[in-house]
Amino acid sequence: MMTGTIETTGNISAEKGGSIILQCHLSSTTAQVTQVNWEQQDQLLAICNADLGWHISPSFKDRVAPGPGLGLTLQSLTVNDTGEYFCIYHTYPDGTYTGRIFLEVLESSVAEHGARFQIP
């Protein structure tokens, strides 16, 4: 039975040209996290494997940085980065947990940022 829950940064906004941290946290389960995948709609951005470490998609290497923790940092944001992002936790024995974040990249010089996410 899957008892875990994923907390995310939720809906966030950032300024064009800036950077943003996408963060998820899996709680309420003792399942072992074997891998976390970060996806943007139909594209895999990065993988953090518990045994093998971080691996960034070659097509995003110049704009995506691993961390902090199991989070992901997006840099040099463009309006095309607006959209849904997913953190997918592969766990044993529970299976897969998915968290969703919506990022809006704003043209204006003032972007309202969502509440800063902290891992308890």
Partner: antibody, heavy 117, light 107 residues
Framework: EVQLVQSGAEVKKPGASVKVSCKAS????????IEWVRQAPGQRLEWMGV????????NYKEKFKGRVTITADKSSSTAYMELSSLRSEDTAVYYC??????????WGQGTTVTVSS | DIVMTQSPDSLAVSLGERATINCKAS??????VAWYQHKPGQSPKLLIY???YRYTGVPDRFSGSGSGTDFTLTISSLQAEDVAVYYC?????????FGGGTKVEIK
């Protein structure tokens, strides 16, 4: 030029072990994964396991756990795959490959392992 | 484990014609699929990674598409040197499973 050069063909008896080497050159050995894949006669390619030479971290396919050991020697830029308790079904060509983001961009020439009594 | 099912098992195409190979994943793999060409007596060669990105030096007659669970490798104009077995592989999660292969021949 990136190259992965594997050790030569081996003939082993059932129950024995085999250790295949894979010497890397032409790139920073610790910046990429080394993956091991085999192909038995008439079968599909089968992924066996992987090592991160930088950290030493490994990940193995469940069916090989306890029978396979993958190691890496940073000083010689060489990875090793040891398979124990050999049986006839382990007769195959064994490949090492450089792992970039978990796909395999350079492959060794392959090492034929024959298990026969 | 994620099962990769390729179709067809074999394909005979006339020189200059299009060859299409399909690969279906048993569960979501995003765009985490690579395609390899394997000729007898040689090591496999990477053609496509992340479903649609052509690897360095691969001729542009090779293209890949798909996301989620359904993927396609297309050879737009088959050449004699393209005779080989083609494999899909998911690089989404360990173990990194391969499809059963598709043998491409000249008709």
């Amino acid at each position: 030029e990136v190259q992965l050069v594997q050790s030569g063909a081996e003939v082993k008896k059932p129950g024995a072990s085999v250790k295949v080497s894979c010497k890397a050159s032409g790139y920073a050995f610790t910046n990429y994964l080394i993956e091991w894949v085999r192909q038995a006669p008439g079968q599909r390619l089968e992924w066996m396991g992987v090592i991160n030479p930088g950290s030493g971290g490994t990940n193995y396919k469940e069916k090989f756990k306890g029978r396979v050991t993958i190691t890496a020697d940073k000083s010689s830029s060489t990875a090793y795959m040891e398979l124990s308790s050999l049986r006839s079904e382990d007769t195959a060509v064994y490949y090492c490959a450089r792992g970039e983001y978990f796909f395999f961009d350079y492959w060794g020439q392959g090492t034929t392992v024959t298990v026969s009594s | 484990d994620i099962v990769m099912t390729q179709s067809p098992d074999s394909l005979a195409v006339s020189l200059g014609e299009r060859a299409t190979i399909n690969c279906k994943a048993s569960q979501h793999v995003s765009n985490g699929v690579a395609w390899y060409q394997h000729k007898p007596g040689q090591s496999p060669k990477l053609l496509i990674y992340s479903a649609s990105y052509r690897y360095t030096g691969v001729p542009d007659r090779f293209s890949g598409s798909g996301s989620g669970t359904d993927f396609t490798l297309t050879i737009s104009s088959l050449q004699a040197e393209d005779v080989a077995v083609y494999y899909c592989q998911q690089h989404y999660n360990t173990p990194h499973t391969f499809g059963g292969g598709t043998k491409v021949e000249i008709k």
